[in-house]
């Protein structure tokens, strides 16, 4: 999906008012310095592409993030503020239903959510120069 035509300000507002705290709660008990940010993004569409990938695509050691509350809210926000997003995701969701995983918080998942926090922070500050 091409995130270029999303309403970025509305997505930012959604993140600040309904998503960010759930990411913090997921990470509770973890030191903020525990993980290094290794995933970066250069602009808002790129950030959303990376956020979508990390949130919804199962990875080795962390297969369950898509069933977390912050993921559900991310899915809802993208569907509302990115034209055509919901249509492109219907087939992907049917495939995901077949391999629905139990929610498990692993160290790998914590690291992945830490990366997500960094991507969201970057998304919210699009005018900053890339480090």
């Amino acid at each position: 999906y091409d995130f270029t035509n999303c309403d970025f300000e509305k997505i930012k507002a959604a993140y600040l008012s309904t998503i960010s705290k759930d990411l913090i709660t997921y990470m509770s008990g973890t030191k903020s310095t525990e993980f290094n940010n290794t995933v970066s993004c250069s602009n808002r569409p790129h950030c959303l592409t990376e956020i979508q990938s990390l949130t919804f695509n199962p990875t080795a050691g962390c297969a369950s993030l898509a069933k977390e509350m912050f993921a559900m809210k991310t899915k809802a926000a993208l569907a509302i503020w990115c034209p055509g997003y919901s249509e492109t995701q219907i087939n992907a969701t049917q495939a995901m239903k077949k391999r629905r995983k139990r929610k498990v918080t692993t160290n790998k998942c914590l690291e992945q959510v830490s990366q997500l926090q960094g991507l969201w922070r970057r998304f919210n500050r699009p005018l900053l120069k890339q480090q």
Partner: antibody
Amino acid sequence: QVQLVESGGGLVQPGGSLRLSCAASGFTFSSYYMSWVRQAPGKGLEWVSGTFFDGSTYYADSVKGRFTISRDNSKNTLYLQMNSLRAEDTAVYYCARQQYFDHIDIWGQGTLVTVSS
Amino acid sequence: DIELTQPPSVSVAPGQTARISCGGDSLGGKYVYWYQQKPGQAPVLVIYGDSKRPSGIPERFSGSNSGNTATLTISGTQAEDEADYYCQSYDLKSLNVVFGGGTKLTVL
């Protein structure tokens, strides 16, 4: 303007079935998570069920296995099929648009379901 | 699912400040929403994301949330504010929406 209009409520005997409908207008229905919330006479609000644009569904424990939520995005309509109805299912049923999955920003006017012999 | 606890009733004199509490385990780690419901009407969202007001909701409505308690504050309460108020959050395991039992606000 944004509107949700419920229909299908009425009197039904215990063990019976009923299907509620909710016609949505004024917004892109297919993009939103939609849900049903009920309110028994003189009591508080109880979330019943919800569904995403892709058909994935969620239910309260009190209705799991008896109620089925569905949607027709081409008709901008949300449904609630209620089977094996009990007296405790008597309530006003509200159709609701759930913003960002976790809260309701638009409510219908409600339709009354009465389960009694 | 988590349980949200509200006082059944709160009374306030016109022009005074009304505070309605909502208690729940580690509630501060989740977002809280508040709805106003008048007799015979559907609920209306008055606070979202702990403390934000939807457009059209008067400034006298405000919210806060920390620890195990969220609070809806109505400053300079008016007769038209008399209604039932419900807090709402969600369960992080089941993902279900959860409502408090409701508080009847009486403006004396």
